[in-house]
């Protein structure tokens, strides 16, 4: 570590005095101190002498000696006071620039340490400091305003009491700059715009920042528009607004609009699309199939997407039959707006009953006219089965009627013993009926099919079962002949158990 002679931390001299500061190190050494006149520098190998034979108040300051070759970067310092009765302050800089919340050092150095007790910081023209100004003083360095705020950007003077009167330094201008967190904040309104040719439109691009130094512009398909800017300051932010007013839009006004703002931190941009149409429009669509099949007792939501301009003047859900004249309950219909021109309308149909199958229509109206979208709702039912014994063309026949939706498939089983349902171990014979006769098949109703099984001899102690199944489920009917050996008898002589 270099050594300074005289080996004192502070040296107090009078104006005009001769001052010699000598620094000695292991290698070459360098002096660093406040820029001031009349110093001469003499270097000789490992020592360096700083001297003046006419010290002035401007030589007041801290002089530091460093050894550039020292890897530890050691240094030594001495503070020189040149106490001038007429000049209590040596101001090293007349402008100080800091960012908000940094400490701001106002470098007015006291030329006489004795005056330290009577120092204060004031604003120019003797005005007091702003409230909440937190500061400290060091005779070596000056006044420090701690955690400086933008509002403290003022002109300051350092004051010292000399012989009962206050003596001021020259003024120091403090500039506290806002910390700019990033590019300006942007809004572009609306986010999307549709107009009919000839209508008026307005697009507003606004940017705001804590600092006034930023630019904003609105461009249409990359063309920067000539829009006069409005400026404002509120909520501690500078705001710049560009308003595009189009009295009568035409197709060339359509396209992409971008609001762009930039400052030293970078650039922000946001875009919107403007669509110009020839006339009003109203489009209805659904992501769902318009033909819906749901199992009875389950629920269904019917959803319609509406794209419209101008806005809707009316809309409703209607049940078109065929079962009853009931209408959907309003509480089951709800509307959500995705954005200005797109809406979703939902009709909730919980726990569907047989009478609720049929056509549901969504109707909407705007100045472009009426539009409707109709859903066809068919309910799925598991098969219901019944079997009877009868004679057809003199032949004994088991007749199975199965009703359900979708159309049921029919299988006959013959099994040993009397049972409610044939299991695999008991099955003697199986017949599939690929083409049962369709008895009824109306829209939104169950499909009823009939299958015939001609039986020459009804075997006692056997069961004949008709099974029907579809995608929803299955149903069956077991026919148990109760007889004493007769091959064929009219059906009223038999009992059958469902």
């Amino acid at each position: 570590i270099p050594v300074i002679e005289p080996s004192v931390p502070e040296l107090v001299v009078k104006p005009g005095a001769t001052v010699t500061l000598r620094c000695v190190g292991n290698g070459s050494v360098e002096w660093d101190g406040p820029p001031s006149p009349h110093w001469t520098l003499y270097s000789d190998g490992s020592s360096s002498i700083l001297s003046t034979n006419n010290a002035t108040f401007q030589n007041t300051g801290t002089y530091r000696c460093t050894e550039p070759g020292d890897p530890l970067g050691g240094s030594a310092a001495i503070h020189l006071y040149v106490k001038d009765p007429a000049r209590p302050w040596n101001v090293l800089a007349q402008e100080v620039v800091v960012f908000e919340d940094q400490d701001a050092l106002l470098p007015c150095l006291l030329t006489d340490p004795v005056l330290e007790a009577g120092v204060s910081l004031v604003r120019v023209r003797g005005r007091p400091l702003m409230r909440h100004t937190n500061y400290s003083f060091s005779p070596w360095h000056g006044f420090t305003i701690h955690r400086a705020k933008f509002i403290q950007s003022q002109d300051y003077q350092c004051s010292a009491l000399m012989g009962g009167r206050k003596v001021m330094s020259i003024s120091i201008r403090l500039k506290v700059q806002k910390v700019i967190p990033g590019p300006p904040a942007l809004t572009l309104v609306p986010a999307e715009l549709v107009r009919i040719r000839g209508e008026a439109a307005q697009i507003v691009c606004s940017a705001s920042s804590v600092d006034v130094n930023f630019d904003v512009f609105l461009q249409h398909n990359n063309t920067k528009l000539a829009i006069p800017q409005q400026s404002d300051f509120h909520n501690n932010r500078y705001q710049k607004v560009l308003t595009l007013n189009l009295d009568q839009v035409d197709f060339q006004h359509a396209g992409n609009y971008s609001c762009v703002a930039s400052n030293v931190q970078g650039k922000h941009s946001t875009s919107m699309f403007f669509r110009v149409v020839e006339s009003a429009y109203l489009n209805l669509s659904s992501e769902q199939n318009l033909i819906q099949e749901v199992t009875v007792g389950e629920g269904l939501n019917l959803k319609v997407m509406v794209e419209a301009y101008p806005g809707l003047q009316g809309f409703n859900w209607t049940y078109l039959g065929p079962f009853s004249d009931h209408q959907p309950e309003p509480k089951l219909a709800n509307a959500t707006t995705k954005d200005t021109y797109r809406h979703t309308f939902t009709l909730s149909l919980p726990r569907l009953k047989p009478s609720e199958a049929g056509r549901y229509s969504f109707l909407a109206r705007n100045p472009g006219g009426w539009r409707a979208l109709t859903f066809e709702l068919t309910l799925r039912y598991p098969p219901e089965v019944s079997v009877i014994w009868t004679f057809i063309n003199g032949s004994g026949t088991l007749l199975c009627a199965a009703s359900g939706y979708p159309q049921p498939n029919v299988t006959w089983l013959q099994c040993s013993g009397h049972t409610d349902r044939c299991d695999e171990a008991q099955v003697l014979q199986v017949w599939d009926d690929p083409y049962p006769e369709v008895l009824s098949q109306e829209p939104f109703h169950k499909v009823t099919v009939q299958s015939l099984l001609t039986v020459e001899t009804l075997e006692h102690n056997q069961t004949y079962e008709c099974r029907a199944h579809n995608s929803v489920g299955s149903g069956s009917w077991a026919f148990i002949p109760i007889s004493a050996g007769a091959h064929t008898h009219p059906p009223d002589e038999f009992l059958f158990t469902p």
């Epitope: 063309t223 920067k224 528009l225 000539a226 006069p228 308003t243 595009l244 007013n245």
Partner: antibody, heavy 118, light 113 residues
């Protein structure tokens, strides 16, 4: 209908000043820059400068800096141009013109004739 | 400043003839961002204020007859009147709005024979 109505002709003496007006109607006055153009037989059309009606900030052709001063009165939707230290070279027709968003003059005033003569 | 040079300074044509006038700029008027030429053409009839004909070098203003066509790019531009009419008697000015100060050409005077 979008219109720019300019004040009437002016006959002024050399060294004097004149202030001509341009009243806008049929559109949002603060929504467009207002420009001023000089037309003299010798120099054809010359752009004088522009004013932002929101802020009053101006951009001048360097040739007219010190000669022309542009101002606006938002409450009456009127733009003004003051010409000072007039000489015979300032005798001309002065037009106000609205700058469209797409950088062309889409609406012009009828023009104000300024004659400088002793 | 950008200097705009128009030629010819005047020309006399008969009704129905095709008219071509030129405008040259001392530097390019083509904006690299949007690939548009910042040049406008105005028509000034005797005793009237100028009236916009064409902007962005080739976009005809609404209501302007389609016999007026603007063309060109960079520094060389042309206004063409395909079939001149008696009401086309006027002075035609080109103007750059690429940078301030905006500048005008000295005009081409069209006379009808």
């Amino acid at each position: 209908e979008v219109r720019l109505q300019q004040s009437g002709p002016e006959l002024v003496k050399p060294g004097a000043s004149v202030k001509i007006s341009c009243k806008a109607s049929g559109y949002t006055f603060t929504g467009y820059y207002m420009h001023w153009v000089k037309q003299s037989p010798e120099k054809s059309l010359e752009w004088i400068g522009e004013i932002n009606p929101n802020t009053g900030s101006c951009t001048y052709n360097q040739k007219f800096t010190g000669k022309a001063t542009l101002t606006v009165d938002k409450s009456s939707s009127t733009a003004y141009m003051q010409l000072t230290s007039l000489t015979s070279e300032d005798s001309a027709v002065y037009y106000c013109a609205r700058l469209n968003y797409y950088w062309y003059f889409d609406v012009w005033g009828a023009g104000t004739t300024v004659t400088v003569s002793s | 400043d950008i200097v705009m040079t128009q030629s010819p300074s005047s020309l006399a044509m008969s009704v129905g003839q095709k008219v071509t006038m030129s405008c040259k700029s001392s530097q390019t008027l083509l904006n690299s961002n949007d690939q548009k030429n910042y040049l406008a053409w105005y028509q000034q009839k005797p005793g009237q204020s100028p009236k916009l004909l064409v902007y962005f070098a080739s976009t005809r203003d609404s209501g302007v007859p389609d016999r007026f066509t603007g063309s060109g790019s960079g520094t060389d531009f042309t206004l063409t009147i395909t079939s001149v009419q008696t009401e086309d008697l006027a002075v035609y000015y080109c103007q750059q709005d690429y940078s301030t100060p905006f500048t005008f050409g000295s005009g081409t005077k069209l006379e009808i024979q």
